[in-house]
Interface confidence: low
């Protein structure tokens, strides 16, 4: 089954089919009997309920809101509501680049070392059954590959492989032809030696908080492309519904390494969140490095020397 749409901020290109899938979809038995509502709000309009009559381009299924296709005026906030479950997304629909086969702002960059294994597979599991054919383009020139359902490149990388690779899926829906484009900017680089990853800032951080408020703990590291950064907390990671690990952000440094940042968001801080360790770890092939955060009630700040506090 296709995963749900967990990212709260989404950018998508106008004119393409698009869908939002809420994350309580696994509760299949509840779904059938419970009232479910999708809402949109944008600018002056506050929480307008969506239904198939809202637009001929919108289709509603149990778990999914589909756009056939998504257009610029679909930009806004979307909400799914079922019993006491709510999920929200902010959708930004951007203009298609009419002079290219892809839109620059919707490109995924990937760095591959020369002579290392290089793979591109064109796949789209959600629309799989509707896809008639798929083409793979390099710098907007069609590549002639055997498989026109899931075109694939698998090889050891050479410098000539550098470029923009666009997977274009062609599909029919209600008698109309649509296409979905996914583009990868592949950069081929010389063999690079690894650094020992390092977490930035002090190893132990006391964070002054107020009960009922929210806090964002930011963990930053300098690391190699394949290193991982993750949060660990509590007995079972992720058992607290008020704790959310945000999407990792990465920026490449001029030396070809990565500056990574991962935020742990704790909402509606309770007593159970105080005086426990929230550990951020960076793990590489050479081992791990960890830094810890402890939430302390503002009233108790006087007990701790000022220099150990972070904001």
């Amino acid at each position: 089954a296709e995963s749900c749409t967990s990212r709260p901020h989404i950018t998508v290109v106008e004119g393409e089919p698009f869908y939002l899938k809420h994350c309580s979809c696994s509760l299949a038995h509840e779904i059938e009997t419970t009232t479910k509502s999708w809402y949109k709000s944008s600018g002056s309009q506050e929480h307008v309920e969506l239904n198939p009559r809202s637009s001929s381009r919108i289709a509603l299924h149990d778990c999914v809101l589909e756009f056939w296709p998504v257009e610029l005026n679909d930009t806004g906030s979307y909400f799914f509501q079922m019993k006491n479950y709510t999920q929200k997304w902010k959708l930004n629909v951007i203009r298609r680049n009419k002079h290219s086969c892809f839109t620059e702002r919707q490109v995924t960059s990937k760095i591959v070392e020369v002579k290392k294994f290089f793979q591109i597979t064109c796949e789209n599991s959600y629309y799989q059954t509707l896809v008639n054919s798929t083409s793979l383009y390099k710098n907007c020139k069609k590549l002639l590959l055997e498989n026109n359902k899931n075109p694939t490149i698998k090889k050891n990388a050479e410098f000539e492989d550098q470029g923009y690779y666009s997977c274009v899926h062609f599909l029919h829906h209600n008698g109309k032809l649509f296409n979905i484009t996914k583009t990868f900017n592949i950069t081929i680089v010389e063999d690079r030696s690894n650094i020992v990853p390092v977490l930035l800032g002090p190893k132990l951080n006391h964070v002054a908080v107020e009960l009922g408020k929210n806090v964002r703990l930011n963990c930053s590291a300098l690391l190699n492309e394949e290193d991982v950064i993750y949060w660990m907390f509590g007995e079972e990671n992720g058992s607290d519904p008020n704790i959310h690990e945000e999407k990792e952000m990465r920026i490449m440094t001029p030396e070809g390494k990565w500056h990574a940042s991962k935020v742990l968001r704790i909402e509606n801080i309770g007593e159970s969140n105080l005086n426990v360790l929230y550990n951020c770890t960076v793990a590489s092939t050479g081992g791990t490095d960890t830094k810890s955060f402890i939430l302390v009630r503002k009233a108790d700040m006087a007990d701790i020397p000022g220099h150990v506090f972070t904001r």
């Epitope: 990937k110 290392k116 597979t121 991982v228 950064i229």
Partner: nanobody, 115 residues
Framework: EVQLVESGGGLVQAGGSLRLSCVAS????????IRWYRQAPGKQREWIAS???????NYADSVKGRFTISRGDARNIGYLQMNSLKPEDTAVYYC?????????WGQGTQVTVSS
């Protein structure tokens, strides 16, 4: 999205062997390295082995010479062959992959080594 499922854990006597599998399903474009970690009760999750997209391998000192990491021909499956197991190898074993710099973890498989 990538989903990971580990299997092959269980109860084994010291000196015995187990082979763990990690299968990545879903969208597996640019799942480059497969890594294994383990977490013993009350301890930090620790890295134990990696295999990169070009099949070069790396091991933590604690398992070097006893554990072997490999990947299947389909490239979306990783293995951890564990020989000469010791009681201190008891832990939940997790596999991890990265796709476009998002980390994906499996649910883990329990390995218990009795003396």
């Amino acid at each position: 999205e990538v989903q990971l499922v580990e299997s092959g854990g269980g109860l084994v006597q010291a000196g015995g062997s187990l082979r763990l599998s990690c299968v990545a399903s879903g969208s597996t474009f640019s799942v480059n390295a497969i890594r294994w970690y383990r977490q013993a009760p009350g301890k930090q999750r620790e890295w134990i082995a990696s295999i990169t997209d070009s099949s070069s391998t790396n091991y933590a000192d604690s398992v070097k010479g006893r554990f072997t990491i490999s990947r299947g021909d389909a490239r979306n499956i990783g293995y951890l062959q564990m020989n000469s197991l010791k009681p201190e190898d008891t832990a939940v074993y997790y596999c991890n992959v990265m796709k476009n710099w998002d980390n994906y973890w499996g649910q883990g498989t329990q390995v218990t080594v009795s003396s």
